[in-house]
Interface confidence: low
């Protein structure tokens, strides 16, 4: 008799999830000498232990603590780049500017980037059919809780000047409900972080507006200032040129505004 299975509103676990996590771990530890000590099988076991046999709407940060411990990593705290709704450009940037790091440049972020996963209560099965959607089903699902946990820790670790890349093409350039707006902003440590510098990325080629004056940016500035952290904002009018100038800062065209 086929066992009844909970139907969730979100997509199911990514195909070949265990193999993908393990392969990513091996690749990451090969590329990053400082993480060569990491035992990838133990990492997978800890990852699996966080959600297997647990109700996928009842996951806690505590469930991920063994994984967090194994994935402990030292990133220069003054070289952190946060992002919101503009992941691809943020990642392109850190691929060029190798001394800056997004969360996905760390082991744990790299392992889980773009993946979905969940289990089922009281069975050791991974659910490849469906997983809870954050809005339609529940917020305490395995994926959301994972990103909330690692994002909080990443933000807590930051110091000096922290940069955040924001998408100027969206109606809410700063969204209080994003991971950045709901988790990272509130976990920057004022005793360590001097300034949050926002880079607002423009979408349209002819867009010359000062998006740093956008009401949502003013809202971000207000939240940050109340936390005793300075705020600064820059318009990146030409993201393509911006990346080009990061690659080749000596280029004569890079002295003008990007």
């Amino acid at each position: 008799v086929p066992r009844w299975r909970q139907q969730w509103s979100g997509p199911g676990t990514t195909k070949r999830f265990p193999e993908t996590v393990l392969a990513r771990c091996v690749k990451y530890t090969e590329i990053h000498p400082e993480m060569r000590h990491v035992d990838c099988q133990s990492v997978w076991d800890a990852f699996k232990g966080a959600f297997i046999s647990k109700h996928p709407c009842n996951i806690t940060e505590e469930d991920y603590q063994p994984l967090m411990k194994l994935g402990t990593q030292t990133v220069p705290c003054n070289k952190i780049l946060l992002w919101s709704r503009i992941k691809d450009l943020a990642h392109q940037f850190t691929q060029v500017q190798r001394d800056m790091f997004t969360l996905e440049d760390t082991l744990l972020g790299y392992l889980a980037d773009d993946l979905t996963w969940c289990g089922e209560f009281n069975t050791s099965k991974i659910n490849y059919q469906s997983c809870p959607d954050w809005r339609k089903d529940c917020s305490n699902n395995p994926v959301s809780v994972f990103w909330k946990t690692v994002s909080r820790r990443f933000a807590e670790a930051a110091c000096d000047v922290v940069h955040v890349m924001l998408n100027g093409s969206r109606s809410k350039i700063f969204d209080k409900n994003s991971t950045f707006g709901s988790v990272e902003v509130h976990n920057l440590q004022p005793e360590k972080v001097q300034t949050l510098e926002a880079w607002v990325i423009h979408g349209g080629r002819e867009d010359s507006r000062d998006l740093c004056q956008d009401p949502t940016i003013k809202e971000l500035e207000s939240i940050i200032s109340k936390r005793n952290i300075q705020f600064s904002c820059k318009n990146i009018y030409r993201p393509d040129k911006f990346l080009q100038c990061v690659k080749n800062p000596e280029d004569s065209s890079c002295t003008s505004e990007i």
Epitope: P33, T74, D99, R153, F154, E156, D160, Q189
Partner: antibody, heavy 117, light 113 residues
Framework: EVQLVESGGGLVQPGGSLRLSCAAS????????MHWVRQAPGKGLEWVAY????????YYADTVKGRFTISRDNSKNTLYLQMNSLRAEDTAVYYC??????????WGQGTLVTVSS | DIVMTQSPSSLAVSLGERVTITCKSS????????????LAWFQQKPGQSPKLLIY???TRESGVPDRFSGSGSGTDFTLTISSLQAEDVAVYYC?????????FGQGTKVEIK
């Protein structure tokens, strides 16, 4: 055995230039960041500059920013410090040091730079 | 910039006695992600270059005698020499390496009474 040998120190007039070298051996030079640290006569240690293994990361102390340039040639296992616009307060023994877990585990014997007219 | 304050600036201790040097940082050196303190201790004997004794606040560098130990977390750190030997006469420096610019304490001179 790790060895770091500095050279290039000497007497120079204020406003002058000097290039220090640090020859490294006994470890895979290109895999490690390197620091310059200085010590004025009878004073404490002052960190000067850092360069990553593949020169991708470079940092300077505010006191030398814009005047000193750190560089390295991994094919020659050599670290450099180009010092321009030298001032009397730059007089010190300059040490190169190998990076280790972000701090410094091996130091050279130092080379003395004297800035005086 | 972050200031590292060492105390005392000098001390004279009898052979075999315990030596305690403290180092205070104006900013926490504890990195929450890995729970490590970014603090090192160096020894500089007269006429010699500095030598790494302790890193991560309490990890002894290989080859360093076990009479040397480091402790502390956050902003307050201690270097202890459990039983002073003649060869321990030196200046001791703490150093923060949490982020750049790196900063050293002003040094503590240890002599024999």
């Amino acid at each position: 055995e790790v060895q770091l040998v500095e050279s290039g120190g000497g007497l120079v007039q204020p406003g002058g230039s000097l290039r220090l070298s640090c020859a490294a051996s006994g470890f895979t030079f290109s895999s490690f960041g390197m620091h310059w640290v200085r010590q004025a006569p009878g004073k404490g240690l002052e960190w000067v500059a850092y360069i990553g293994g593949d020169s991708n990361i470079i940092y300077y102390a505010d006191t030398v920013k814009g005047r000193f340039t750190i560089s390295r040639d991994n094919s020659k296992n050599t670290l450099y410090l180009q010092m321009n616009s030298l001032r009397a307060e730059d007089t010190a023994v300059y040490y190169c040091a190998k990076s280790h877990d972000y701090t410094m585990d091996y130091w050279g014997q130092g080379t003395l730079v004297t800035v005086s007219s | 910039d972050i200031v590292m304050t060492q105390s005392p600036s000098s001390l004279a201790v009898s052979l075999g006695e315990r030596v305690t040097i403290t180092c205070k940082s104006s900013q926490s050196l504890l990195y929450s992600t890995n729970q490590k303190n970014y603090l090192a201790w160096f020894q500089q004997k007269p006429g010699q270059s500095p030598k790494l004794l302790i890193y991560w606040a309490s990890t002894r560098e290989s080859g360093v005698p076990d009479r040397f130990s480091g402790s502390g977390s956050g902003t307050d750190f201690t270097l202890t020499i459990s039983s002073l030997q003649a060869e321990d006469v030196a200046v001791y420096y703490c150093q923060r390496y949490y982020n750049y610019p790196y900063t050293f304490g002003q040094g503590t001179k240890v002599e024999i009474k």
